[in-house]
């Protein structure tokens, strides 16, 4: 690697993937193994993230970018950059601080993560229940008796799933 020549800061010419080595007259040296620098002009390289335990490697570390982790089967990511792996539950359950618990009557969860959500209240839309809800599925709303004329829409899709705002323990 060339010795840098910037008049202001000789380190500013060191590209990503290198660091400005004070021990070698501020020569741009490549990042050592298992480290990276994502921007130029850095005086040190950062240690690569290691994906261990229930974390697994989604993207390997390179000299210019950190490793990225996701979670092993049975767990899912939470937090920025997958800072946590949270245990999956079965459909029809939610994770509480005490572990996976069945959804209470009147609520459902159709995913392995997230919280139990209330069944859709069909009557709010002037509709009737076409298919009853379960722990795993929302109710299916059908037309109200007044709407049973030909060509009427018969099904209202369930509300989209939303993510939990917390991570229980």
């Amino acid at each position: 690697f060339e010795r840098t020549r910037s008049l202001q800061d000789p380190c500013s010419n060191c590209p990503a993937g290198t660091f400005c080595d004070n021990n070698r007259n501020q020569i741009c040296s490549p990042c050592p193994p298992n480290s990276f620098s994502s921007a130029g002009g850095q005086r040190t390289c950062d240690i690569c993230r290691q994906c261990k335990g229930v974390f697994r490697t989604r993207k390997e570390c390179s000299s210019t970018s950190n490793a990225e982790c996701d979670c092993t089967p049975g767990f899912h990511c939470l937090g920025a950059g997958c800072s946590m792996c949270e245990q999956d539950c079965k459909q029809g359950q939610e994770l509480t601080k005490k572990g996976c618990k069945d959804c209470c009557f009147g609520t459902f969860n159709d995913q392995k993560r997230g919280i139990c959500r209330p069944w859709t209240n069909c009557s709010l839309d002037g509709k009737s229940v076409l298919v009853n809800g379960t722990k795993e599925r929302d109710v299916v709303c059908g037309p109200s008796p007044a709407d049973l004329s030909p060509g009427a829409s018969s099904v209202t899709p369930p509300a989209p799933a939303r993510e939990p705002g917390h991570s229980p323990q």
Epitope: G53, V54, M84, C85, E86, Q87, L95, K97, P168, Q169
Partner: antibody
């Protein structure tokens, strides 16, 4: 960054009470059980119990029932451990940790520890 | 309460040599959800404990691959393939399956 900062060392008289604090940053304590662990000088680790800061629900090891009281204040993101009727047996370092069986953080988190010395 | 028995009490090992610590529980640590909540912690002198291994064999981030955890039911082992100077301290097993949670008595690893 996820951290747990515990209150400073305490020198207290026998029979007195003391309240220790454990303040979290980088996460909400209401989302986790906060556990307290005791370590007497040159001894091993002893689990005291845990609190659910969301509703104040507590579980104690029977031997600490009446001796220890765990509370939490979610507005200040702080868990507390009060120790009463102190004796020399309570001289120890006390740690807090948000241990979980179901959520694994990229880094395990323990408090810095608070040293309690009971002496007349 | 579940009693966690660790052996040996003290382990004196030459740097570069292997080490093994045993932890036996008085009841099975297999939970009804099929998981075994057995952790290994290391407490270095003057520091807070730090978890090394959870769920019997899962290494925490930053823990070198020379550490391995194994076992099931009531018998668990922590192995260090080649001990390094930074490994000295007291090792504890900790079960989170049964209430109350309990720790082993600790194994002090000394460097010869």
């Amino acid at each position: 960054e996820v951290q747990l900062q515990q209150s400073g060392a305490e020198l207290v008289r026998p029979g007195a009470s003391v309240k220790l604090s454990c303040t979290a940053s980088g996460f909400n304590i209401k989302d986790y059980y906060m556990h307290w662990v005791k370590q007497r000088p040159e001894q091993g680790l002893e689990w005291i119990g845990r609190i659910d800061p969301e509703d104040g629900d507590t579980e104690y090891v029977p031997k600490f029932q009446g001796k220890a009281t765990m509370t939490a204040d979610t507005s200040s993101n702080t868990a507390y451990l009060q120790l009463s009727s102190l004796t020399s047996e309570d001289t120890a370092v006390y740690y807090c940790t948000p241990y979980s069986n179901y959520v694994y953080w990229y880094f395990d988190v323990w408090g810095t520890g608070t040293t309690v010395t009971v002496s007349s | 309460d579940v009693v966690m028995t660790q052996t040996p009490l003290t382990l004196s090992v030459t740097i570069g040599q292997p080490a093994s610590i045993s932890c036996k529980s008085s009841q099975s640590l297999l939970d009804s959800d099929g998981k075994t909540y057995l952790n290994w912690l290391l407490q270095r002198p003057g520091q807070s404990p730090k978890r090394l291994i959870y769920l019997v064999s899962k290494l925490d981030s930053g823990v070198p691959d020379r550490f391995t955890g194994s076992g099931s039911g009531t018998d668990f082992t922590l192995k260090i393939s080649r001990v390094e100077a930074e490994d000295l301290g007291v090792y504890y097993c900790w079960q989170g399956t049964h209430f109350p949670h309990t720790f082993g008595g600790g194994t002090k690893l000394e460097i010869k």
